[in-house]
Interface confidence: medium
């Protein structure tokens, strides 16, 4: 999901170019300071160099660009705009570069950009138009196919006075630019909920990773439109139960594999439908590993081994009999 290339493809020697011939323009295959370049692999790596800005003198041939482990802080509009444009750039990895602000149009003028990884950056301010480039109600389609946004939640004291989930979703939905997105990774972001409209507007999704968040419920989330969805990662959340509507929608997706490990399933009367569904469905990977977390008497029981007699609810006491 992020640009890779083998280290052996990087040339270990380079010409010294000490020619006294008539003046020429700068060499097209020059490598920016603090970077490693392989024209054969069309790859530039500027990794762990404490760069504070994107190098301006990137070679035009670059197809895979790694800018990981730096101190970029801000990606301004047109951060990668060059003349001539970086027309070949297809995979851009900016993970772990201390970005806290990505401005509108940061990725404009990258006509071939298919993979973008912004993971492990504390994005306190992600512009709604970071990926769409404009505030038009319908923008030009983005070429992005993979968007990796794992662990982009900033520390609590750096968050703006607004919903982090809302900020991320606004950027995903602006201008309907990401209609072609096939992979979206949003793991480890402390998401408490998934805004209901987000998935409906990303109809091309094949892979969705929401693992290691704090999702309590999927009641208001619709998967119905995601007819191409192949994998849905919901491991390590706070899910208590999946209700009938969600179960039916997941069952109706032709290619889906769902991952549900390490959720605190509540094995009471509300779990009956899910247990029945689990016993019949093929869509849940590792379903034999799912265990109850609550109530205490059910802890560590395997969901697939439960029957309806196990799944009871304490009777609701009338108000006059309730204690404080």
């Amino acid at each position: 999901s992020s640009p890779t290339s083998s280290a052996s493809s990087f040339s270990s020697s380079a010409p010294f170019l000490a020619s006294a011939v008539s003046a020429q323009p700068p060499l097209p295959d020059q490598c920016p300071a603090l970077c490693e370049c392989s024209e054969a692999a069309r790859t530039v790596k500027c990794v762990n160099r404490n760069l504070t800005e994107v190098p301006t003198d990137l070679p035009a041939y670059v197809r895979n660009l790694f800018l990981t482990g730096n101190q970029l802080a801000v990606l301004p509009a047109g951060a990668f705009a060059r003349r001539p444009p970086l027309a070949e750039l297809a995979a851009l990895n900016l993970s772990g570069s201390r970005l806290d602000e990505v401005r509108a149009g940061a990725f404009e003028h990258l006509p071939s950009l298919r993979q973008l990884d912004l993971s492990h950056n504390p994005l306190a301010d992600l512009s709604p138009f970071a990926f769409s480039g404009s505030n038009a109600s319908v923008s030009a389609p983005s070429p992005l196919v993979e968007l990796i946004l794992n662990h982009i939640v900033p520390p609590e004291d750096e968050r703006q006075n607004r919903s982090f989930e809302g900020m991320v979703v606004a950027a995903l939905l602006a201008g309907r630019a990401l209609q072609g997105l096939r992979r979206l990774e949003l793991a480890s972001n402390h998401f408490l909920y998934l805004p209901r409209d987000v998935l409906a507007q990303l109809p091309s999704l094949r892979h969705l990773d929401l693992s290691n968040n704090s999702l309590v419920s999927l009641t208001y989330v619709s998967f119905r439109n995601l007819t191409h969805l192949e994998s849905l990662h919901l491991e390590d959340n706070a899910l208590k139960v999946l209700h009938n509507g969600t179960l039916a929608e997941l069952q109706g997706l032709p290619h889906i594999r769902v991952f549900l490990d390490n959720n605190p399933w509540v094995c009471d009367c509300h779990m009956a439908d899910m247990v029945t569904w689990l016993k019949e469905t093929e869509v849940v990977q590792g379903k034999d590993r799912l265990t109850c977390a609550y109530p205490e008497k059910m802890r560590n029981r395997v969901l697939l081994e439960l029957n309806s007699a196990d799944l009871d609810c304490d009777p609701i006491l009338p108000p006059s009999l309730q204690t404080s």
């Epitope: 490693e36 404490n50 301006t56």
Partner: antibody, heavy 120, light 111 residues
């Protein structure tokens, strides 16, 4: 033969300005990043500033940031260092040096240096 | 900033004998592919001259009695048989990140 010749050094009072030049010959100047490095009397080497081949990228040492400006004129094959708000601790021999196209290769050619003395 | 620590500070060598200078970086200056450490010789009254680039690559025109090795944080410059003309100060320098820094230098003298 690659040659780098610095000029413009001299004695200057604290707070004043000076502009150093480095004339390059024997190679295609516009293809190479260039650096300034200095050496205080009896001391070691200190990197000062860098400019990319097409003047699109600049880097500075913290000790000179905001006071010194590196520039170049590829049509004249010349590198410059504009030094403002000079301090006594800027007293040094200033060398210009060439970076190969691939930066993992160190500074392959150096000028003889020009001496800057900041004193009241 | 990356600090480069050179040892020893000075070295007195008999002609024909080997010499070794160490340079230790406060953090790694190597990628999986390359090392961004270089060695220079500076003779009295002259500018530095590049001897070894990228840890172990001999600069053209430099005698092959000079060699370099190392990766990560530990690097070594070796002179297999010291000659009288090798007197001077030797510096290591990294180009891993900004600012580039130099070691404090090692002074080589002839006994």
């Amino acid at each position: 033969e690659v040659q780098l010749v610095e000029s413009g050094g001299g004695v200057v009072q604290p707070g004043r300005s000076l502009r150093l030049s480095c004339a390059a010959s024997g190679f295609t100047f516009s293809n190479f990043g260039m650096h300034w490095v200095r050496q205080a009397p009896g001391k070691g080497l200190e990197w000062v500033a860098y400019i990319s081949s097409g003047s699109s990228t600049f880097y500075y040492a913290d000790s000179v940031k905001g006071r010194f400006t590196i520039s170049r004129d590829n049509s004249k094959n010349t590198l410059y260092l504009q030094m403002n708000s000079l301090r006594a601790e800027d007293t040094a021999v200033y060398f210009c040096a060439r970076s190969p196209a691939y930066y993992r290769y160190g500074l392959d050619y150096w000028g003889q240096g020009t001496t800057v003395t900041v004193s009241s | 900033d990356i600090v480069l620590t050179q040892t020893p500070l000075s070295l007195s060598v008999t002609p024909g004998q080997p010499a070794s200078i160490s340079c230790r970086a406060s953090q790694s200056v190597s990628s999986s592919t390359f090392s961004y450490m270089h060695w220079y010789q500076q003779k009295p009254g002259q500018p530095p001259q590049l001897l070894i680039k990228s840890s172990s690559n001999l600069e053209s025109g430099v005698p092959d009695r000079f060699s370099g090795s190392g990766s990560g944080t530990d690097f070594t410059l070796k002179i297999s048989r010291v000659e009288a003309e090798d007197v001077g100060v030797y510096y290591c320098q990294h180009s891993w990140e900004i600012p580039y820094t130099f070691g404090g230098g090692t002074k080589v003298e002839i006994k």
